[in-house]
């Protein structure tokens, strides 16, 4: 599997999970989220050749057609396939609020 | 939606679906299906600007980030959202067999 | 281009045998099921002997007029199939086509071998 | 066994004349949406030529005043205006199952 148990700890330049680290208001400018500060997204990228964790039968039908006709602008792309939620905290007003925002961390890829 | 109906007819640079035509035989190098000759695949290209047709929160918030960091190398992709099956034809020595592939044609895409 | 070139035809007597042949080129001959299909005078199109592919283990038909008589055979090495004929007989006098047939239909044909079956 | 029986079995016609020559299954040979009927072209001394595969799809070099239509049981193959090089006897075949099996044939004279 393209998750980061794999991806973190290898030098892979196909699709994979990269680490990034947002900071809620210096990469994002979100004043309002108190906790955490920032936090692992992570995201997907590498090319995605013929077969690798194709996502449907169109990518890997795409990855082939991609293989025999180098030349062609369209090929599968990297993506998230799972997703973890993050859980902040802000404000409203002086009452603080725990929310659970789903789909905030990736920790998988697929080609789709 | 970034759909057949909406992208096949506007000359639309962002994320959308664009026609491609795949025949099994030259394309796939697929000899064994007969029936149809090929079909329209279609694929999904173009930049996931911030808020296009999001797929999650984490499209989202990376293309914030994005915005926010155009330099930065992470960013949403234009992938399919759905995708319809294709029935097609092939023999199994001399027995014919029709089969539905799942997810051969998209339809529309989404920013993921 | 699709060439199939039969041989092997003939006068042969009632009992006889003769091996016909029929060698392609043109195509990829080891991924495609090959047929004999026969003509009698003042008849119609008969499919006497088929076989498919190694893929599909080479599985063979017979019509039920040449069963146990005729067996068809390919060596995909030389891109050709045969049909031995044993035990003929004069209702077996036709000429005799090798055809190919990539999916249901015989898109290419030989242009045909004569079998003659007479005293 | 699927038994294809063609119809008329002969036909004397003119060149420029439209003919329709039928073939009908004993059961269906259709499967999904494909018609597995094909056409044949036969002239003495010749090898069959493909004119027509799955029912209604041209074969490569045919000419396009052949055609073909049909679905489960009954199948037509028409010329919409008969040359003198079209004068032949024409074959239906199908590929439902094991074995395939040809039509008796059909005959086409010049009157």
């Known amino acids: 599997a393209l998750d980061t148990n794999y991806c973190f700890r290898n030098l892979e330049e196909n699709c994979c999970v990269r680490p990034l680290y947002i900071d809620f208001r210096q990469d994002l400018g979100w004043k309002w989220v108190h906790e955490p500060k920032g936090y692992y997204a992570n995201f997907c990228s590498g090319p995605c050749p013929y077969l690798r964790s194709a996502d449907t039968t169109h990518s890997t039908v795409l990855g082939l057609y991609n293989t025999l006709n180098p030349e062609a602008s369209a090929s599968p792309c990297c993506v998230p396939q799972d997703l973890e939620p993050l859980t902040i905290l802000y404000y409203v007003g002086r009452t603080p609020k725990v929310e659970q925002l789903s789909n905030m961390v990736v920790k998988s890829c697929k080609c789709s | 939606a970034l759909d057949t109906n909406y992208c096949f007819r506007n000359l639309e640079e962002n994320c959308c679906v664009r026609p491609l035509y795949i025949d099994f035989r030259q394309d796939l190098g697929w000899k064994w299906v007969h029936e149809p000759k090929g079909y329209y695949a279609n694929f999904c290209s173009g930049p996931c600007p911030y808020l296009r047709s999001a797929d999650t929160t984490h499209s989202t918030v990376l293309g914030l980030y994005n915005t926010l960091n155009p330099e930065a190398s992470a960013s949403p992709c234009c992938v399919p959202q759905d995708l319809e099956p294709l029935t097609i034809l092939y023999y199994v020595g001399r027995t014919p067999k029709v089969e539905q592939l799942s997810n051969m044609v998209v339809k529309s895409c989404k920013c993921s | 281009e699709v060439q199939l070139l039969e041989s092997g035809g003939g006068l042969v007597q009632p009992g006889g045998s003769l091996r016909l042949s029929c060698a392609a080129s043109?195509?990829?001959?080891?991924?495609?099921?090959m047929s004999w299909v026969r003509q009698a005078p003042g008849k119609g199109l008969e499919l006497v002997a088929d076989i498919v592919s190694k893929t599909y283990n080479y599985t063979t038909y017979y019509s039920d007029s040449v069963k146990d008589r005729f067996t068809i055979s390919r060596d995909d090495s030389k891109s050709t199939v045969y049909l031995q004929m044993n035990s003929l007989r004069a209702e077996d006098t036709a000429v005799y086509y090798c055809?190919?047939?990539?999916?249901?239909?015989?898109?290419?044909w030989g242009q045909g071998t004569l079998v003659t079956v007479s005293s | 066994d699927i038994q294809l029986t063609q119809s008329p079995s002969s036909l004397s016609a003119s060149v420029g004349d439209r003919v329709t020559i039928t073939c009908r299954a004993s059961q269906s040979v259709s499967i999904s949406r494909f018609n597995l009927m094909h056409w044949y072209q036969h002239k003495p001394g010749k090898a069959p030529k493909l004119l027509i595969y799955?029912?209604?799809n041209l074969a490569s070099g045919i000419p396009s005043r052949f055609s073909g239509s049909g679905s489960g049981t009954d199948f037509t193959l028409t010329i919409s205006s008969l040359q003198p090089e079209d004068f032949a006897t024409y074959y239906c075949q199908h590929s439902r199952e094991s074995p395939w099996t040809f039509g008796g044939g059909t005959k086409v004279e010049i009157k």
């Open positions: 043109g195509f990829d001959f080891n991924s495609y099921g």
């Open positions: 799955r029912a209604s």
């Open positions: 055809t190919v047939a990539p999916g249901g239909s015989f898109d290419y």
